[in-house]
Each structure stands twice: as C-alpha cells, then as structure tokens.
Amino acid sequence: RKIPKVGHTFFQKPESCPPVPGGSMKLDIGIINENQRVSMSRNIESRSTSPWNYTVTWDPNRYPSEVVQAQCRNLGCINAQGKEDISMNSVPIQQETLVVRRKHQGCSVSFQLEKVLVTVGCTCVTPVIHHVQ
Amino acid sequence: GITIPRNPGCPNSEDKNFPRTVMVNLNIHNRNTNTNPKRSSDYYNRSTSPWNLHRNEDPERYPSVIWEAKCRHLGCINADGNVDYHMNSVPIQQEILVLRREPPHCPNSFRLEKILVSVGCTCVTPIVHHVA
C-alpha cells in the first residue's frame, strides 16, 4: 500500500516540500523523541499472572537494528498459590512497528520500509472452548 | 527499491551505519497485516485484565490510526467474575516507530518518530507500600 496522500484540500503540496523521485519518498531517520523513556511499572513481566521473557533480535541491515521480542513463559496462568493454572491461557499481545530494511544489490544499496510485528508482553485470558458435535 | 550507488571501494568498504536521510520505496513490505486489534483478536474482552481500545487519528502520521489500550479496571477479574483489587491491571507499553510528515503536509517526505503506545493490559501482583 502506498503512503496515503490524504485529501487534496489539506495536502496541497507546500512550496517547502523537497523534490522526491517518483515511486519513492524521502525519509529522515533521525528519530523524533529518540530519548523518551518507557515508564512501565517495575518488572511487570515477572509480576504478571502471565509472565514473559524478553529476547533481543539483532540485524545490522535493519534500522533500528535491535528489536526486543517477548515470549510467554507458560501456556497457563499463574494462580494465587504461584502454580500454573491450565484452565486459563497466557497469550501474547502484539503491536506493529515500522523498520527500515537495507538491501544490497551488487554494489548498490536500497532501502525499504517494513512493518514488523512485535510481541510486547502477555495477558491471561479465559480460553475459548470449542465443543465437538 | 531505490538503488543508491555504494562507495568506490565496493564491495570491501561496507558502511555499517545507516545514513541520516534515505530514499525509500513507497511500497511497505508486510503492509497487509491487520492494524485493527479489535478484528485481530478478542483478548481485550477475554483477559482477566480487560481493556478498551481508543482510536487515535493523526493525518500527519503514518499509520494515521493507532489504537490505544486503556485498562478497564484497577483490579483483575477473578474466577467469580468480580473485580479483585488484590491484583492490579496495568498497561503494557511499547515504543513504536511511525512516520511523521516533515515538513508538515508534504506528501512524500517523512521523519521517523518514536511514540509510546499502550498495547494491552496484564494482571500483576501489586507492590504494597506501607507507611511507617
């Protein structure tokens, strides 16, 4: 899908817009809000009834090169006694983010935007029970 | 994609860092993944820490629509279907990258922006602070 050119009345190209070759767009990868911090509650990944671990994926041809993925530790959820309760399910919560992919073609380099699905954490849900007829 | 010639030293002198500004293809890879979390799963309703999804729309951003989760309760839903405050519902937050039109209103010029979104909620044991 192309980046939407929203309503012509609003997006009349201002004089200040940089010239861009057809079929491409100019992307500044100096990130706005680069230094903002996530203010999540302390170690919720361990305190959750559906706890999870983190792994870091690394790819030098991706920007950002480091993407953190969560994996649920259990199939069930942890009950008040600290035991796994398999009548409930730990499930991953996912979110899309954008990355820039660098591709090498001979002695040339091209850049492609890519949507990546990140698993952010886990939540405990009541299972959907499918009864067999 | 748009090809950019590499340095004369190619293939030996590989630039490890990304340039500050790049030209990228208008087509986004993996673009067809579902962006409406209400359609992709019903976890928001079945969770013991259920959440509501709020639509955040900004035409100067891509994607222009982002769904923000807000925990429905301070406590978690127990086996009896009651809200139990011995446990706490908390949001799971994630930094994501989006595109911001820069300069504003330009159709094909963007800058990456990092934003913090609440993706869903999870049920945690609270940290209790007693007053001495």
């Epitope: - | 301070l74 609270p126 602070h129």
Partner: antibody, heavy 120, light 112 residues
C-alpha cells in the same frame, strides 16, 4: 444531563432485608459504573459496592455476605439488596456514577439519597 | 482497609480567606499503573456529596479554579484560594486505589 435517583422504603424492621433501586438518566449503564455509598446520620461516608459497566462487581468485604448488586441496562436501573438489617444500618443511601472513559474510578455524580431507618 | 486521616476536622474561616485541608493515607495510593486515585468531595448541608478534584489535582467539570489539589503517595492537600459563601460545607477526601474505597472523616469549613 446526568441524573441519578434512589428509591426504596423509609422504614425497615430489624433482621429484614432492604431493596433500593437507582434509576439513572442522561447516560447509559453500558458506559458507567454505579457505586453505592451510605452515610449514617451526622457521620461520614461508607462505600458499599460497585457494579461496573461490563457487569463485573466489587464489594466491601466487611459487608459482602449481606449485599448483592445487579442491574438492568435497558431500564437504566441498578438494584441493591441488603440482608439482616440492624439499627446501625440506619443511614442515607446514595448511588453514584463513575464514567468509564475518564478512567478515574471515582464517583463523579451522586443521587440525592434515600433515607432508610431500621426500627421496630 | 486504607485509613484516611483528615486535618483539621473543623476549619473556621472568613470569606475571602485562603483555606487549606490536609489528608493522609495509611498506605501509598500509587497504583501499579503509576496513577494515584485520590479525590476530594464537598457536601453542603442537606445535599449529597459532589466531586471537586479527582486523581490528586484534576478539577472536575464546573469546579472553579480557586480550588486546587496537590500531593503524592500518602500526603495530600486541598487549597481554596479565596473562600466564598458557596464553598461552606464538609470536605471529604477519598481513595479508590484500594478496596474498600475509603473516605476521610470530613472537614467542616464554616464561618468564624
């Protein structure tokens, strides 16, 4: 605009049960939680129970065995039942609303209250 | 249960004065989500309580800006910059971080 009105008996005999209805207008019970709070004459406020917009409930554990709460969204009514009343249950009983999408989990609008006296 | 201790219990003022009411909770009111669910209500004689301030410092709709709330953790304050006749009544602090939701005993703001 948001309005809540409590209705119930003025007088209840000791050991009997009390049923009070909160009828709301200007908003939907599918977006608001409803709390019940009581206030004995000349005293402070005591929170009893809440029924949230999704039908889930939270009780004051000190009174849970004597209380039950339910609602009918289509009639915009919330019902409180309290069993085994004693004289110290004499109080003004208020219902109060809590708008889900403010996420402040408190009582933003209150009814005018219904006065209940427990006496033989 | 979380005990809410209000001081003073009675506050005689003259119209136009500044008034300050304190409330202390027996445990922190910071929820695991980072928010503090502490609130102030005003109950005028013969009326039901009305919400003034929610989540420590947010004025509820229609509340004049002479009312301000502050504090964190366990210690909170309500200030009225210039008391008007319509401000007289009993002020209750309240918390909804923990169940049961609890209220302070009330502070009676009255004329000297």
């Amino acid at each position: 605009q948001v309005q809540l009105k409590e209705s119930g008996p003025d007088l209840v005999a000791p050991s009997q049960s009390l049923s009070i209805t909160c009828t709301v207008s200007g908003f939907s019970l599918t977006s608001y939680g409803i709390h019940w709070v009581r206030q004995p004459p000349g005293k402070g406020l005591e929170w009893l129970v809440v029924i949230w917009s999704d039908g889930t409930t939270t009780y004051n554990s000190a009174l849970k065995s004597r209380l039950s709460i339910s609602k009918d969204n289509s009639k915009s009514q919330v019902f409180l039942k309290m069993n085994s009343l004693q004289t110290d249950d004499t109080a003004m009983y208020y219902c109060a609303s809590s708008y889900d999408y403010l996420y402040h989990y408190t009582m933003d609008y209150w009814g005018q209250g219904t006065s209940v006296t427990v006496s033989s | 249960d979380v005990v809410m201790t209000q001081t003073p219990l009675s506050l005689p003022v003259s119209l136009g004065d500044q008034a300050s009411i304190s409330c202390r909770s027996s445990q922190s009111l910071v929820h695991s989500n980072g928010n503090t669910y502490f609130h102030w209500y005003l109950q005028k004689p013969g009326q039901s309580p009305k919400l003034l301030i929610y989540k420590v410092s947010n004025r509820f709709s229609g509340v004049p800006d002479r009312f301000s709330g502050s504090g964190s953790g366990t210690d909170f304050t309500l200030k009225i910059s210039r008391v008007e006749a319509e401000d007289l009544g009993v002020y209750f602090c309240s918390q909804s971080t923990h169940v049961p939701l609890t209220f302070g005993a009330g502070t009676n703001l009255e004329l000297k």
